[in-house]
Amino acid sequence: LCQGSNYSTCASCPSCPDRWMKYGNHCYYFSVEEKDWNSSLEFCLARDSHLLVITDNQEMSLLQVFLSEAFCWIGLRNNSGWRWEDGSPLNFSRISSNSFVQTCGAINKNGLQASSCEVPLHWVCKKCPFADQALF
């Protein structure tokens, strides 16, 4: 069940771990605390998930319903162009940097924002659901 890469489309699985929200075929974790981008990434990876990679405008719009004005880290970085952590380019939305240190991406209810990766922000993890919550 839900085998394969972190980034692959999940099958329709029954449930998500505690404190994770099921939406569509994925589980999402919206953090309460704040960390820098690298620490946020490590948090997600340690829980067999990844910093949020948004696949299309529809997913982005759906997720923004759950967001506030506060920015959250997502799996988006500028390495010679804005790319998601799965290696795919950002091609359904726009983000621009105002300074050379703004190389990580964040999201709030209004859209995407470039930021210095050092800024402590909330973050969003994404993973496939598990058949058995006890596995988490």
Epitope: N98, F100, A106, Q113, S116, V119
Partner: antibody, heavy 120, light 107 residues
Framework: EVQLVESGGGLVKPGGSLRLSCAAS????????MSWVRQAPGKGLEWVAT????????YYPDSVKGRFTISRDNAKNTLYLQMSSLRAEDTAVYYC?????????????WGQGTLVTVSS | DIQMTQSPSSLSASVGDRVTITCRAS??????LAWYQQKPGKAPKFLIH???TLAEGVPSRFSGSGSGTDFTLTISSLQPEDFATYYC?????????FGQGTKLEIK
């Protein structure tokens, strides 16, 4: 209310050293890049140094590189500028400045400045 | 390094006038430009970022425009408190360079 208060300016001889401080209040200091900008008497503004949130990255123009060192103490909400091998052309009012947030490196807030005079 | 050149260096105008100050970059800086106002003996005040976005609390008579290499700061109707020196600044990369300033004086 954001407040930046510089101190440590004064008269120093050429070749001497001085350390400026900037006490920050009214915001979460450890979330922002900080900078020093100076202004020689009757002249324009010149960027002097910028430091990242953690202090791990520092940036300088060629005019002060190797002579000035920017640092910060996030526990004390204080920014520093250590100046050495001072020259007459370093005479200026030195301003501490905070960025706009998220690494937006314009100078959104400024202190009142502290005067450094380099003269024999 | 990117050089910023302001014109004019000084300008005389009257209360109520519309005034435009120009800033030119030595190469394309897209919209990475800020404007500041400074009064004698005081610290600069942040006015505009990204060439046209007004900082919080800045009166709407101030506006910025331009992209690439040519930028303008416009004051639509000068008020007595607007007489000051204005600086532009490149804010994307190192070094963060300022223009030499434009002194706006009362005619």
């Amino acid at each position: 209310e954001v407040q930046l208060v510089e101190s440590g300016g004064g008269l120093v001889k050429p070749g001497g050293s001085l350390r400026l401080s900037c006490a920050a209040s009214g915001f979460t200091f450890s979330r922002y890049y900080m900078s020093w900008v100076r202004q020689a008497p009757g002249k324009g503004l010149e960027w002097v140094a910028t430091i990242s949130i953690s202090g791990g990255n520092t940036y300088y123009p060629d005019s002060v590189k190797g002579r000035f060192t920017i640092s910060r103490d996030n526990a004390k909400n204080t920014l520093y500028l250590q100046m050495s091998s001072l020259r007459a052309e370093d005479t200026a009012v030195y301003y501490c400045a905070r960025e706009g947030g998220y690494g937006n490196l314009w100078f959104a807030y400024w202190g009142q400045g502290t005067l450094v005079t380099v003269s024999s | 390094d990117i050089q910023m050149t302001q014109s004019p260096s000084s300008l005389s105008a009257s209360v109520g006038d519309r005034v435009t100050i120009t800033c030119r970059a030595s190469e394309n800086i897209y919209s990475a430009l800020a404007w500041y106002q400074q009064k004698p003996g005081k610290a600069p005040k942040f006015l505009i970022h990204n060439a046209k976005t007004l900082a919080e609390g800045v009166p709407s008579r101030f506006s910025g425009s331009g992209s690439g290499t040519d930028f303008t700061l416009t004051i639509s109707s000068l008020q007595p408190e607007d007489f000051a020196t204005y600086y532009c600044q490149y804010h994307y990369g190192i070094p963060f360079t300022f223009g030499q300033g434009t002194k706006l004086e009362i005619k």
